[in-house]
Amino acid sequence: DFGLDCDEHSTESRCCRYPLTVDFEAFGWDWIIAPKRYKANYCSGECEFVFLQKYPHTHLVHQANPRGSAGPCCTPTKMSPINMLYFNGKEQIIYGKIPAMVVDRCGCS
Amino acid sequence: DFGLDCDEHSTESRCCRYPLTVDFEAFGWDWIIAPKRYKANYCSGECEFVFLQKYPHTHLVHQANPRGSAGPCCTPTKMSPINMLYFNGKEQIIYGKIPAMVVDRCGCS
């Protein structure tokens, strides 16, 4: 299992992971105490046939070619959590591990 | 976590799981002994903002709106394996649980 890593200077057109810092303050999300910002990353690029396919299923659907099935798209295939400190809306402050906040790898599915 | 289920008569335009039977014989894959065919399903449909989003990350990337980030796409969010009996290319026949062969749920990511 692997995926491509790119940056803003890359000329790669295929499915790739790009750096992205999410800034909660810029969103006006003041209910998040910490972190103020974090490296989230995102996926972008083209999914040519078989390139970086996560699942055998993706290949099988391409073979079967059912009505209305789009080609695979560039999407997170591995994600990880971050720890956050936040108001939970009930006047409580919670420290918790929030799943699927960081993209570690991108692929076609 | 939930997802929509549709069939060929559905008028649903949003991201949905559709039935699909994969027939290995029709593909000419004679290295697969069993099953001959199985219910794989597939995902198709539109991903309007926030609809069936699997990850908070998807929403955050939409907010941050980085260069080249496409909107979320309709993709498997829950998959399951099937047991297969197949020739492994080394004159051996193997029984194995092949992961991510069946789409159980679709969502936007």
Epitope: - | E25, G28, D30, I33, I93
Partner: antibody, heavy 116, light 107 residues
């Protein structure tokens, strides 16, 4: 109704050769892998060989590898087992079987006796 | 090669009895075990595949269970036509191997 009919068995001397056939009917022969399984008199079952539905892939245990060759003719709905360099320990009833996850249909078998 | 050890090698039972036959694999075979019934002078018949799936047309009194290395064939209420020899087989990886058989006889 699925039917598998083996033929070609008989008495052969050690070192000799024999070709078994299995005529299949009642199912789409070309869609299924096929196997041979044998049973020595009064003994248990032993897998001998398997061939894929299209005939591209084969598998054998070490006990027969290099001596036995499985093949098929999908146009004739027939499975074959070519047995060379036969030994006394190859004496058995040979069954052909339709293959799914397991052997789901068996023929009635043909007896091969290797003796001088 | 994977060894399949079947027990008992023979048993005597009466019509209506519950009969249990076990098979132990020498290594993990997941759920890749089949069970066959063979009567004298006849070809084996498939009863159970993938440990617990009853084959088409097999009476519901036959059931299979187990995974890993330990497997069981159970006949919930023995019928006159069930007196036969039963074999387990692993279909996990070639060379496929069979147990030595269990002969079920009339008490």
């Amino acid at each position: 109704e699925v039917q598998l009919l083996e033929s070609g068995g008989g008495l052969v001397q050690p070192g000799g050769s024999l070709r078994l056939s299995c005529a299949a009917s009642g199912f789409t022969f070309s869609s299924y892998a096929m196997s041979w399984v044998r049973q020595a008199p009064g003994k248990g079952l032993e897998w001998v060989s398997t061939i894929s539905s299209g005939g591209s892939y084969t598998s054998y245990p070490d006990s027969v590898k290099g001596r036995f060759t499985i093949s098929r003719d999908n146009s004739k709905n027939t499975l074959y087992l070519q047995m060379n360099s036969l030994r006394a320990e190859d004496t058995a009833v040979y069954y052909c079987a339709k293959q799914d996850y397991a052997f789901d249909y068996w023929g009635q078998g043909t007896l091969v006796t290797v003796s001088s | 090669d994977i060894q399949m050890t079947q027990s008992p090698s023979s048993l005597s039972a009466s019509v209506g009895d519950r009969v249990t036959i076990t098979c132990k694999a020498s290594q993990d075979v997941s759920t890749a075990v089949a069970w066959y019934q063979q009567k004298p002078g006849k070809a084996p018949k498939l009863l159970i595949y993938s440990a617990s799936y009853r084959y088409t047309g097999v009476p519901s009194r036959f059931s299979g269970s187990g995974s890993g290395t330990d497997f069981t064939l159970t006949i919930s209420s023995l019928q006159p036509e069930d007196f036969a020899t039963y074999y387990c087989q692993q279909h996990y990886s070639t060379p496929w191997t069979f147990g030595g058989g269990t002969k079920v006889e009339i008490k």
